[in-house]
């Protein structure tokens, strides 16, 4: 039995798979910030996490996934005050009782450290210094993701 | 209809200890960040802690860091504020308020209770 | 911190009258500038949120204007229940600062 926050998940993880390819991304669209191999965008309103995972959606991106704890200070870095939560792209998966990422992958139990409740209804934000579970019903700012394309060097012969 | 009652002002001597709570009730409160925010005798308005709808994050005012404690029960629906360390200045009413995390505004407010620091 | 700083401190009117209330902020903080009404005994009530959002139940009289550090709360025709002091505040950053109030009195 799926809950709705994981029906949502999944609904509009596979209407991204269904779209037709697009182009890779070679700069970050304007007001995104770019982070590495990532363009983001931070919202400034708020609102539920599923509202939150929709409105990445129809921006051809992501709810913010992080591969790592270099990837979270990282992002953290750009959180501009302390009093400021962002939703990223995981949640509390009821049917295998475990956090789950929007792609599909797990939590892995080092990557990040949760203050809070890993129970139904939960999904995950991250402010300047942590990294907490807040009910997903919470109306709070959100983080979307762009990947970028890697560019490869290309090698010219001598002209 | 949002509802937020104080209870748990009085008179305190310098020094001293007094717990606050207030009664949230009319919306799902454990989705909401919440508020302290107080009001001296005759003067404006001062924030002076917020908490998280888990309860998870919390940050204060310089002037009341290390002495009080902001904490909420989403069983039952209750905010609190642990005031230890009591000193003069703390003496004011104490509102809690919905609201707190950017870029909230606080759009219900309690009655207020008195906390009045004197020897 | 954010200083907030309200002008007038305070203000005579009459009913009917068009009264308007500035605040300015020491840095600039967007549009995450909220006001609030308060009654003598009473907690203050939330009028208007991001600057010029009317708060759900607030008579329309009352409009809120501005951006960055200069804002304007009017009320465009002054009832005898809005007779009261009124405070803006910042949400841009921590720690949430309030202006230092302006009373407006019945002339």
């Known amino acids: 039995q799926k809950s709705s926050i994981e029906k949502c998940s999944v609904d509009i993880q596979q209407s991204r798979n269904k779209t037709t390819e697009r182009p890779g991304l070679l700069n970050c669209p304007i007001y995104w910030q770019q982070l590495r191999e990532k363009c983001l965008l931070f919202s400034h309103t708020v609102n539920p996490w599923n509202n939150s995972l929709a409105d990445c959606s129809t921006k051809e991106s992501s709810l913010l996934l992080i591969r790592d704890k270099d990837e979270l200070i990282h992002t953290q870095n750009l959180i501009r005050d302390k009093a400021i939560l962002f939703w990223i792209g995981l949640n509390f998966s009821l049917s295998e009782k475990n956090w789950k990422w929007i792609n599909g992958s797990f939590l892995n139990s080092n990557d990040l450290e949760i203050r809070g409740d890993a129970k139904e209804n939960s999904c995950i934000s991250i402010s300047q210094t942590s990294v907490y579970s807040e009910y997903c019903s919470t109306e709070i700012r959100w983080i979307c993701q762009k990947e970028l394309t890697p560019v490869r060097n290309k090698v010219y012969p001598d002209s | 209809e949002v509802q937020l009652v104080e209870s748990g002002g009085g008179l305190v001597q310098p020094g001293g200890s007094l717990r606050l709570s207030c009664a949230a009730s009319?919306?799902?409160?454990?989705?909401?960040?919440m508020s302290w925010v107080r009001q001296a005798p005759g003067k404006g308005l001062e924030w002076v802690s917020a908490?998280?709808?888990?309860?998870?994050?919390?940050y204060y005012a310089d002037s009341v860091k290390g002495r009080f404690t902001i904490s909420r029960d989403n069983s039952k629906n209750t905010l609190y504020l642990q005031m230890n360390s009591l000193r003069a200045e703390d003496t004011a009413v104490y509102y809690c308020?919905?609201?707190?995390?950017?870029?909230?505004?606080?759009?219900?407010w309690g009655q207020g209770t008195l906390v009045t620091v004197s020897s | 911190d954010i200083q907030m700083t309200q002008s007038p401190s305070s203000l005579s009117a009459s009913v009917g009258d068009r009264v308007a209330i500035t605040c300015r902020a020491s840095?600039?903080?967007?549009?995450?500038l909220n006001w609030y009404q308060q009654k003598p005994g009473k907690a203050p009530k939330l009028l208007i949120y991001?600057?010029?959002s009317l708060q759900s139940g607030v008579p329309s009289r009352f409009s809120g204007s501005g951006s960055g550090t200069d804002f304007t709360l009017t009320i465009s025709s002054l009832q005898p229940e809005d007779f009261a002091t009124y405070y803006c505040?910042?949400?841009?950053?921590?720690?949430?600062?309030f202006g230092q109030g302006t009373k407006v009195e019945i002339k």
């Open positions: 308020a919905r609201g707190g995390y950017l870029p909230d505004a606080f759009d219900y």
């Open positions: 009319g919306f799902t409160f454990s989705s909401y960040a």
């Open positions: 908490i998280s709808g888990s309860g998870g994050s919390t």
């Open positions: 840095q600039s903080i967007s549009s995450y």
């Open positions: 991001a600057a010029s």
């Open positions: 505040q910042q949400s841009y950053s921590t720690p949430l600062t």
